[in-house]
């Protein structure tokens, strides 16, 4: 098949394989204190570390990306971190005839992989 | 909305920013050699280049991964140039009944954004 | 599951042109590497390879016949077309279409009978 | 063109016996050769690729070998159903060219 596996532990050592983390944001830092009301503070999972050679790939491309880094790195990035499905939230945000809740499932991240 | 536009110029200059690009690679090149008959070289389109703020962001995520990069570029990453979409490639390869065509969804990039 | 089945006029008369059609499924000709060849077959003797079209629209012909032949697809309806113009009475046979993965004629439809005759 | 010479036109064979059908090119075609099944009355059938690699889901009596210029496809225990014309085609260059075929019949 295709799929080499890809490996789960991390060869770099504890917390430096691409994982999910959580960052503190403030409607400030997002730039969203105009029109949004609520929460005020998110917390955000974000996708961060590093992506050895098929640690969690994403599919089959990632896996010849990994490989073909190897061979030629100047050329092929390596992959990288990134989100591999979402966690929906929903946000209090001001509209022309009031206010209203909206769900925005791209935000949060739920899952990661190297892609 | 909470999706800023996304860029679609490069600021960095032509070719810097995430794009696709043809790699050609063989099937030693792969490790597939044993188990793969044909194509004998695959022209496998990949996303290299860099991530500029807001450079053609995947989502909503990754406007919020770019503006929190700003502000805290040690914890957190720049987004990065990952395959949006794949093409299907067909693969003639040996199973324990004989050699027969396999489609692989995952296997080629079609297009490219920030993620 | 993978089919493909060739239609086409059944009886012309020579200097007329012919239009054959493969409609296929289980597959499709957006996917690299696949694509479809024309090959025909006069009663009771061997296969001649006529056309074939790829995945990316490149387009092969055999050169004894090219002048003549026009092969071209429809690939969101799953369908190849092949024309061949002034068909004469040594155009009688069999046509088939086959599928290609890298070459290899995989699977066949059941093929459709041309009769030049005047 | 690659001519494809298949020189038996008819071979006849028993039940449970071990039949070669050869196919000879003109010109060096590597290991670019294909092996088809014709039954009576049916659309030919794929049985090798790259001379020697049979194709899913045929029976492990049939295998092909060769390279260069000269191939064989060997029918090990031939069965009544393996009654058909054999033929081999190159895809090493265009045009595509098959053998003229072998017949296969069964005593």
């Known amino acids: 098949s295709a799929h080499a596996h890809p490996r789960d532990s991390c060869p770099l050592g504890p917390g430096r394989c691409c994982h999910l983390e959580t960052v503190q944001a403030t409607l400030e830092d997002l730039g969203w204190s105009d029109w949004v009301l609520s929460p005020r503070q998110l917390q955000l999972s974000m996708c961060v570390g590093e992506c050895p050679h098929l640690y969690r790939s994403a599919n089959t491309h990632a896996q010849i990306k990994a490989r073909l880094h190897g061979l030629q790195p100047d050329k092929v990035p390596a992959p990288c971190c990134v989100p591999s499905s979402y966690t929906p939230v929903v946000l209090m945000h001001r509209t022309d005839s009031g206010v209203s809740l909206q769900t925005y499932d791209d935000l949060v991240a739920r899952g990661c992989h190297c892609a | 909305s909470a999706h800023a536009h996304p860029r679609d110029s490069c600021p960095l200059g032509p070719g810097r920013c995430c794009h696709l690009e043809t790699v050609q690679a063989t099937l030693e090149d792969l490790g597939w050699s044993d188990w793969v008959l044909s194509p004998r070289q695959l022209q496998l389109s990949m996303c290299v280049g860099e991530c500029p703020h807001l450079y053609r962001s995947a989502n909503t995520h990754a406007q919020i991964k770019a503006r929190l990069h700003g502000l805290q570029p040690d914890k957190v990453p720049a987004p990065c140039c990952v395959p949006s979409s794949y093409t299907p490639v067909v693969l003639m390869h040996r199973t324990d009944s004989g050699v027969s065509l396999q489609t692989y969804d995952d296997l080629v990039a079609r297009g490219c954004h920030c993620a | 599951q993978v089919t493909l089945k060739e239609s086409g006029p059944g009886i012309l008369q020579p200097s007329q042109t012919l239009s054959l059609t493969c409609s296929f499924s289980?597959?499709?000709?957006?996917?690299?590497?696949?694509?479809v060849s024309w090959i025909r077959q006069p009663s009771g003797k061997g296969l001649e390879w006529l056309a074939h079209i790829y995945w990316d629209d490149d387009k092969r012909y055999n050169p004894s016949l090219k002048s003549r032949l026009t092969i071209s697809k429809d690939t969101s309806s799953n369908r190849v077309f092949l024309k061949i113009t002034s068909v004469d009475t040594a155009d009688t046979a069999t046509y088939y279409c086959a599928r290609t993965g890298w070459d290899f004629f995989d699977y066949w439809g059941q093929g459709t009978t041309l009769t030049v005759s005047s | 063109d690659i001519v494809m010479t298949q020189s038996q036109k008819f071979m006849s064979t028993s039940v449970g016996d071990r039949v070669s059908v050869t196919c000879k090119a003109s010109?060096?075609?590597?290991?670019?050769v294909a092996w088809y099944q014709q039954k009576p009355g049916q659309s030919p059938k794929g049985l090798i690729y790259s001379a020697s690699y049979r194709y899913s889901g045929v029976p492990d009596r049939f295998t092909g070998s060769g390279s260069g210029t000269d191939f064989t496809l060997t029918i090990n225990n031939v069965q009544s159903e393996d009654l058909a014309e054999y033929f081999c085609q190159q895809y090493n260059s265009y045009p595509y060219t098959f053998g003229g075929g072998t017949k296969l019949e069964i005593k």
């Open positions: 010109q060096n075609v590597g290991t670019n």
């Open positions: 289980g597959f499709s000709l957006s996917t690299s590497g696949m694509g």
